[in-house]
C-alpha cells in the first residue's frame, strides 16, 4: 500500500505564438481545479477499467479575474498535493491523465458551470520511494508543469511497496534473511507468506508464494545444502543450481535514477533508463532541443535552438502528445457500450460486442426481459431493443444486487435537494427548475443555476456545490 502524490507547479500559456485566451473574465471570474487518473502499466488500458490505480480531485484554486488587455499569466493554483492512495503493490509503470477544470463563478445562462480546459496524458516508469520526478506537458496552447512521486505507507517498503517492516525484536540485528528497512533502520523486514514448505531457517521471500534461499542452501524449498564454491556471482538472487545469495544493499536499492528513470543492475554497477527529455548517469540532466529529435511519428520540431528554450512538436494527423508519441486514441472516448471492446482500425472504429449485445456501438441488448432476473424486487424495463433493471428503493446496479442510497448518486440537478422516499427518491427543485430530477430550467436565460458537481467528486463531498 502507498500513495501517489502529484504537485502542480504551474498552469498557463505555453511557449510560442498563439497564447490562449484567459479562461476567466471580469464578467465570469473563475477558479481552477485538477483531476488525476492513474492506470497501471505502460500499454493503453481497456476503456472499461478507467483509473484502475485510483483518481483524485484537488481543492479549488483562488478566484481569478482577468485584467483587461493583459496577457494570460500562469493561473493561480489550488494549495496542496493531489494524493491517490493505492492499496496493492505499486506497479512501477503507469499511465496518467491530468485534467485542468474551470469552475465558473458568474451567472450561468444555459451553459455548464464546469468546463474542461486541458487534458494531458502520459506513460511513465516510477519506483516507489524514489525522489520527485518533474514533468512538463502541453495541451494545445496550455502548458502544465508538475512533479510526482510514489511513496509507500508503513509498514510497506521497497520499490513496489511489497516488502513489509516491523520493529526489531533484537536491538542489533534482524532475523535470518531479513534486511533492515531503509529508511527505517530501526525496523526489519517482516517475513512474507512464502511458498508452502519453504525452509524458515534457510529460505525467505520478497513476493508472496516464492522461496529464495540464503547462501549455502538450494532446492525449491531451500532444504538442500550446497557448497559455497558453486557461487557464480558475488550477489544476486538464488537459484536451484547455485543457491547463492549474500544479503546486502544492491546498486539499485533506493533507485538512484532521478526524474522517473528506471534502474537495472549491471555486472559492475547500475544503469538508468531515462524517460524522454532526461539524460545522464542518473537521468539528472534535462534540456531537450530540436537537435535531439524529440518529435516522434514524423512530428515537426519548432524552436528549442538552445537548451534553455523549449521546443514544440507539431504532430501529423493521428498523433498527439508533447512529443507526438501518442496515437490519437478514439477508443478513449469509450464509444462501445455494455463492455464492448473498441478497435481503432485507423479508417474506422469497430466495437466487438460481448455475448448478448449487438449494434455498431453494442448498444442493443439481444436478450429480452423474459430471461432476465432483477433482484431485490427490481423490474425489467425494455425499450428500443435494450433493457435494464429498474431497481426498488435502496438497491442499484445492473441487476439490482447492490445496496444503494438513492440520493448517493446526486440524482437532482441544478441544486435540487434529494430526499429518500418509500416510493423512490424525491427531488425538491430550486426556484426556476422543474422535472423529476430538476433538470429543466423553466426560463434558461433567467435561471440562476447552482453548478452541478464535476467528474470525480464523490457523493457527499462537502465541495459539491458553491
Amino acid at each position: 500500500a502507498g500513495v501517489f502524490e502529484l504537485q502542480i507547479h504551474s498552469f498557463g500559456p505555453g511557449p510560442g505564438p498563439g497564447a490562449p485566451r484567459s479562461p476567466c473574465s471580469a464578467r465570469l471570474p473563475c477558479r481552477l481545479f485538477f483531476r488525476v487518473c492513474l492506470k497501471p502499466g505502460l500499454s493503453e488500458e481497456a476503456a472499461e477499467s478507467p483509473c484502475a490505480l485510483g483518481a483524485a480531485l484537488s481543492a479549488r484554486g483562488p478566484v481569478y479575474t482577468e485584467q483587461p488587455g493583459a496577457p494570460a499569466p500562469d493561473l493561480p493554483l489550488p494549495d496542496g498535493l493531489l494524493q491517490v492512495p493505492f492499496r496493492d503493490a505499486w506497479p512501477g509503470t503507469f499511465s496518467f491523465i491530468i485534467e485542468t477544470w474551470r469552475e465558473e463563478l458568474g451567472d450561468q445562462i444555459g451553459g455548464p458551470a464546469w468546463s474542461l480546459l486541458a487534458r494531458v496524458a502520459g506513460r511513465r516508469r516510477l519506483a516507489a520511494g524514489g525522489p520527485w520526478a518533474r514533468d512538463i506537458q502541453r495541451a494545445g496552447a496550455w502548458e502544465l508543469r508538475f512533479s510526482y512521486r510514489a511513496r509507500c505507507e508503513p509498514p510497506a517498503v521497497g520499490t513496489a511497496c511489497t516488502r513489509l517492516c516491523r520493529p526489531r525484536s533484537a536491538p542489533s540485528r534482524c532475523g535470518p534473511g531479513l534486511r533492515p528497512c531503509a529508511p527505517l533502520e530501526d525496523e526489519c523486514e517482516a517475513p512474507l507468506v512464502c511458498r508452502a514448505g519453504c525452509s524458515p531457517e534457510h529460505g525467505f521471500c520478497e513476493q508472496p508464494g516464492e522461496c529464495r534461499c540464503l547462501e549455502g542452501w538450494t532446492g525449491p524449498l531451500c532444504t538442500v545444502p550446497v557448497s559455497t564454491s558453486s557461487c557464480l556471482s558475488p550477489r544476486g538472487p538464488s537459484s536451484a543450481t547455485t543457491g547463492c545469495l549474500v544479503p546486502g544493499p544492491g546498486p539499485c536499492d533506493g533507485n538512484p535514477c532521478a526524474n522517473g528513470g528506471s534502474c537495472s543492475e549491471t555486472p559492475r554497477s547500475f544503469e538508468c533508463t531515462c524517460p524522454r527529455g532526461f539524460y545522464g548517469l542518473r537521468c539528472e540532466v534535462s534540456g531537450v532541443t530540436c537537435a535531439d529529435g524529440p518529435c516522434f511519428n514524423g512530428g515537426l520540431c519548432v524552436g528549442g535552438a538552445d537548451p534553455d528554450s523549449a521546443y514544440i512538436c507539431h504532430c501529423p494527423p493521428g498523433f498527439q502528445g508533447s512529443n507526438c508519441e501518442k496515437r490519437v486514441d478514439r477508443c478513449s472516448l469509450q464509444p462501445c457500450r455494455n463492455g464492448g471492446l473498441c478497435l481503432d482500425l485507423g479508417h474506422a472504429l469497430r466495437c466487438r460486442c460481448r455475448a448478448g449485445f449487438a449494434g455498431p456501438r453494442c448498444e442493443h441488448d439481444l436478450d429480452d426481459c423474459a430471461g432476465r432476473a432483477c433482484a431485490n424486487g427490481g423490474t425489467c424495463v425494455e425499450g428500443g431493443g435494450a433493457h435494464r433493471c429498474s431497481c426498488a428503493l435502496g438497491f442499484g446496479g445492473r441487476d439490482c444486487r447492490e445496496r444503494a442510497d438513492p440520493c448517493a448518486a446526486r440524482p437532482c440537478a441544478h441544486g435540487g435537494r434529494c430526499y429518500a422516499h418509500f416510493s423512490g427518491l424525491v427531488c425538491a427543485c430550486a426556484p426556476g427548475y422543474m422535472g423529476a430530477r430538476c433538470e429543466f430550467p423553466v426560463h434558461p436565460d433567467g435561471a440562476s443555476a447552482l453548478p452541478a458537481a464535476p467528474p470525480g467528486l464523490r457523493p457527499g463531498d462537502p465541495q459539491r456545490y458553491l
Partner: nanobody, 117 residues
Framework: EVQLVESGGGLVQPGGSLTLSCAAS????????TAWYRQAPGKKRELVAG???????VYFDSVKGRFTISRDNAKNSVYLQMNSLRAEDTAVYYC???????????WGQGTLVTVSS
Amino acid sequence: EVQLVESGGGLVQPGGSLTLSCAASVYSVYDLSTAWYRQAPGKKRELVAGISDDGSTVYFDSVKGRFTISRDNAKNSVYLQMNSLRAEDTAVYYCYAYSWITRSPYWGQGTLVTVSS
C-alpha cells in the same frame, strides 16, 4: 460533447399538426434528460415539454393535452408531436439535453415553427 440536431419545423395553419425531431450524438439517450424549449420574438425562452431519463414527462400549462413529448431509444431521438396549433405557438423551438454523465446542459440550433393562415 453532446450535439443536438433539430428538424421538422415549418409553416402550418392554425389547428394543424407538426412533429419536431431531435437527434442526439450519443450512444444512448438513457444518459440524457431531454426537453423542448421555445422562444417567440421579444420573449424569454421557455420550457415546453421535458422527458426525464426515467421516462417521466413535464409540460408547460398552455400545451398540456395538445403537445406530446416522446423518445426513441434505438434512434437516440426525441420528438415533440404538436396538435391543435395556435398562432401563439409561433416560435423558434430548441432541443435541450441534460447529460447525467457530464452534468451539463446542451442546446440545439433551433427550428422555426410558424403558425399562420
